[in-house]
């Protein structure tokens, strides 16, 4: 088997043969190694020696093999557009931003832009539940049979009924989507719009 | 239809102070961070402060840091610029901006004269 | 902070004509660029954002380019309504500044 060609080597037909950590230069015809992430070319390849690269300075970045002959710089997570930091830059990754609690993203440009305060869910409601926390507003969904939320709430989540049972109570009033059952000792009389139930 | 309108401006001696309003409709203005931009006359365009949505996070420009103040009521839907300590050079047209992305001002308000001189 | 540099400070043109504005950084700014057009008495008015993204109503004759630290703003075929003064302004980070301003004047 043929040896391995170790940049630079020449390309008759402007390929190389690693895409991912070679580029082809056109001026000399030849693949020249890519620099790997978190550094840059600090000297062009020719025909006899391959890419000299260095390191990223501090607060500057570069994601991906490249043949860049600078690093991007870092930008923080901007509070002022309702975004913060849930990782800092490193030489070999940008400032990973998220929204803050209680908003979701409202504008994308390749990462997220914008956030907004999520919209709150009426009562007898709730939001639904996402994959990923901050990707979206809130949908909210009826609260499920047994259950109740009494707020209006971005976040507010919906619970179940009280079992007045279970307290060694009795139910006075059902619960609605809206309200929890309402509980009585049960040796409490009705109150008198409830009496006639008391008869039936 | 966006609109911004600005008022409170006037004539104000050195050291005074003054609180402009941007009254914002046609959007829901909870959502966006807002700024101040001011121009003096004949002069450029110079970005004075935002704030977030919230009211929660603000920026400022250095040379008005300490004498000035954003803040926002979401409830009236207005935001607000306390000047305090006022001198001859914050003599300008100050203009209210929605603040977008982060990255740009895409609706401005028209604009109120604040001068300062004795 | 970051200064923003625009060339020339004032242009004469005359009607049809291709204009050409140009916005230096101080320092790379990567596509956090916008440009604005301001007539006398009234208030900017965003054209471009974002180094090339057109802004919703503008007329297409206008475009913009670059990224890093050197920016262009270009007005293909300038009508009687384009003579205005033209800002750039970075968006990179704060403090937000804006370049000292181009006059563009009918020759």
């Known amino acids: 088997s043929q040896p391995q060609a170790v940049p630079p080597y020449a390309s008759e037909n402007q390929t190389c043969r690693d895409q991912e950590k070679e580029y082809y230069e056109p001026q000399h015809r030849i693949c020249c190694s890519r620099c790997p992430p978190g550094t840059y070319v600090s000297a062009k390849c020719s025909r006899i020696r391959d890419t000299v690269c260095a390191t990223c300075a501090e607060n500057s970045y570069n994601e991906h093999w490249n043949y860049l002959t600078i690093c991007q710089l870092c930008r923080p997570c901007d509070p002022v557009m309702g975004l913060e930091e849930i990782a800092p830059c490193t030489s070999k990754r940008k400032t990973q931003c998220r929204c803050q609690p209680g908003m979701f993203c409202a504008a994308w440009a390749l990462e997220c832009t914008h956030c907004e305060l999520l919209s709150d869910c009426p009562p007898g409601t709730e939001a639904e539940l996402k994959d990923e926390v901050g990707k979206g507003n809130n949908h909210c969904v009826p609260c499920k049979a047994g259950h109740f939320q009494n707020t209006s709430s971005p976040s507010a989540r919906c619970q179940p009924h009280t079992r007045c049972e279970n307290q060694g109570l009795v139910e006075a009033a059902p619960g609605t989507a809206q309200s929890d059952t309402t509980c009585k000792n049960p040796l409490e009389p009705l109150p008198p719009e409830m009496s006639g139930t008391m008869l039936m | 239809e966006v609109q911004l309108l600005e008022s409170g401006g006037g004539l104000v001696q050195p050291g005074g102070s003054l609180r402009l309003s941007c009254a914002a409709s046609?959007?829901?203005?909870?959502?966006?961070?807002m700024s101040w931009v001011r121009q003096a006359p004949g002069k450029g365009l110079e970005w004075v402060s935002a704030?977030?949505?919230?009211?929660?996070?603000?920026y400022y420009a250095d040379s008005v840091k300490g004498r000035f103040t954003i803040s926002r009521d979401n409830s009236k839907n207005t935001l607000y610029l306390q000047m305090n300590s006022l001198r001859a050079e914050d003599t300008a047209v100050y203009y209210c901006?929605?603040?977008?992305?982060?990255?740009?001002?895409?609706?401005w308000g028209q604009g109120t004269l604040v001068t300062v001189s004795s | 902070d970051i200064q923003m540099t625009q060339s020339p400070s004032s242009l004469s043109a005359s009607v049809g004509d291709r204009v050409t504005i140009t916005c230096r950084a101080s320092?790379?700014?990567?596509?956090?660029l916008n440009w604005y057009q301001q007539k006398p008495g009234k208030a900017p008015k965003l054209l471009i954002y974002?180094?090339?993204s057109l802004q919703s109503g503008v007329p297409s004759r206008f475009s913009g380019s670059g990224s890093g630290t050197d920016f262009t703003l270009t007005i293909s075929s300038l009508q009687p309504e384009d003579f205005a003064t033209y800002y750039c302004q970075q968006g990179w980070w704060y403090p937000l500044t804006f370049g000292q301003g181009t006059k563009l004047e009918i020759k």
């Open positions: 974002a180094a090339s």
């Open positions: 046609g959007f829901t203005f909870s959502s966006y961070a």
């Open positions: 704030i977030s949505g919230s009211g929660g996070s603000t």
């Open positions: 320092q790379s700014i990567s596509s956090y």
């Open positions: 901006a929605r603040y977008y992305w982060g990255w740009y001002f895409d609706y």
